[in-house]
């Protein structure tokens, strides 16, 4: 039985410090947890956005959480990879990215995660309903494919800021929080000099100098988060798929890169072809709740079922389990 | 009230595919997650595939034992999905359940929040 659980980000306590037999007495039976109710599940995360800054710009990204190591990732869109889908882009860890049009740009984000930036064909709308699938071919658990689209809220038209990375939510908490206790404070103060003063209090006019004063405080910090944390990533215009498009392709095998379909701005010239697009190296990329997930452990290469021509230079990484949403 | 209705069950032979479809319809505004289980014959109902949304993002976790021969995927109006079945063997006959609910916090098991569950389809794999 597959089950999920969340927690939160965890870092080792620091030694000697007051209480850390405590803390990791705390966090073990966590650990424990989320090691026991994750393990065997794959879970693939894909996300959609249409910027606000532009109509009808589109950004996917897709991220795999499990135990196994990514041997390949296709992206897809009109439907699974399998069924109808058209694909955009293929990325492998050694032989690079390959990508067709209306895909501009496709790369690694984290080692198991990629993003994908459609361009466009001069369609002055998007397609609301366009589905995007992302294929992860992963060792030793097999081939996960999930699809994403865009929201039904989603509004090309509103002049709302794009949504924040999902990270943001704690830090905007914490911020918002601060700033509300803020101007609860300047209020309270007002009420303190009021009642001090014997005469009545002169107007300071606080619903027009007061409130907004604090408000406009709280504001700024989180836009200035929303822009120090928010992932960028280029905007652009994409169509409706477009019937020129070539139809999805099988990859696997020797020639994996010779047989997926050839595009006139993209015709192979064996692997050298192929943009060497480096992945990320490991780092400490630990993030909370939508697809994100804490990266550690080390194993040795391995080659995927199907893909024996293509071992794995990274390694897979250790358990990563998916957090629950909302 | 959430009313379900599966839809593409059948006979197919082994190594064959189907699609399921599983609509839903009525108060399906707080809807976040669907997903599609299966009781063999003689066995338990296991967990096969779910589907969450939250915002932009879409979120699908698929039973281990799988290998990666089925997919599970939604329409963006949140109100229907679709489970492809490749290569199918025996061992995956059953009736299929779609279940849907809302998740508002941690899901510690895979019906976590499923409240509404539809009548079943039968997939029968047979040569």
């Known amino acids: 039985m597959r089950t999920e659980a969340q927690v939160p980000a965890l870092q080792p306590p620091e030694p000697g410090l007051e209480g850390a037999m405590g803390h990791r007495t705390l966090v073990l039976p966590w650990v424990l947890l989320t090691l026991c109710v994750t393990a065997g599940t794959p879970e693939v995360w894909v996300q959609v956005r249409m910027e606000a800054t532009e109509l009808s710009s589109f950004t996917i990204r897709c991220g795999f959480l499990g135990s196994g190591s990514i041997s390949l990732v296709t992206v897809s869109w009109g439907g699974p990879n399998g069924a109808g889908g058209t694909t955009l882009a293929v990325l492998h860890p050694e032989r690079g990215i390959r990508q067709w049009a209306p895909a501009r740009q496709a790369r690694w984000e984290t080692q198991s995660s990629i993003s994908l930036i459609l361009e466009g064909s001069g369609a002055s709308s998007p397609c609301a309903n366009t589905t995007f699938c992302c294929k992860f071919a992963s060792f030793p658990e097999g081939s996960w494919e999930a699809c994403g689209s865009l929201p039904p809220s989603s509004d090309p038209g509103l002049s709302a800021p794009p949504t924040p990375a999902p990270i943001l939510r704690a830090d905007l908490a914490g911020i918002l929080g601060v700033s509300g206790v803020l101007l609860f404070g300047c209020v309270y103060l007002l009420h303190l000099l009021r009642r001090h003063k014997h005469r009545p209090a002169p107007r300071l006019q606080p619903s027009r100098t007061s409130p907004q004063a604090p408000r406009a405080r709280a504001w700024a910090p989180s836009q200035a988060s929303q822009a120090a944390l928010h992932v960028p990533y280029a905007t652009i215009n994409t169509s409706c798929r477009p019937a020129t498009l070539d139809t999805a392709h099988p990859h696997g095998g020797p020639s994996w890169w010779a047989s997926l379909p050839t595009h006139a701005a993209h015709r192979p010239q064996g692997p050298a072809a192929w943009a060497s697009t480096p992945i990320p190296a490991r780092g400490s990329f630990v993030s909370v709740e939508n697809g994100l997930y804490a990266q550690a452990g080390e194993r040795p290469p391995h080659t995927g079922p199907g893909l024996t021509l293509f071992p794995d230079p990274r390694g897979p990484r250790a358990m990563e389990g998916p957090l629950g949403v909302r | 009230q959430v009313q379900l209705v599966e839809s593409g069950g059948g006979l197919v032979q082994p190594g064959g595919s189907l699609r399921l479809s599983c609509a839903a319809s009525?108060?399906?505004?707080?809807?976040?997650?669907m997903g599609w289980f299966r009781r063999a014959p003689g066995k338990e109902r296991e967990f096969v595939a779910r589907?969450?949304?939250?915002?932009?993002?879409?979120?699908?976790a698929y039973a281990d034992f799988l290998k990666g021969r089925f997919t599970l995927y939604g329409a963006v109006a949140r109100n229907r999905v679709y489970l492809q079945m490749n290569s199918l063997q025996p061992e995956d006959t059953a009736v299929y359940y779609c279940?849907?609910?809302?998740?508002?916090?941690?899901?510690?098991?895979?019906?976590?929040?499923?409240?509404?569950w539809g009548k079943g389809t039968l997939v029968t794999v047979s040569s």
């Open positions: 279940a849907a609910g809302e998740v508002s916090g941690s899901s510690y098991s895979p019906d976590y929040g499923m409240h509404y």
């Open positions: 009525g108060r399906t505004d707080s809807m976040n997650v």
């Open positions: 589907i969450k949304w939250n915002g932009d993002t879409t979120y699908t």
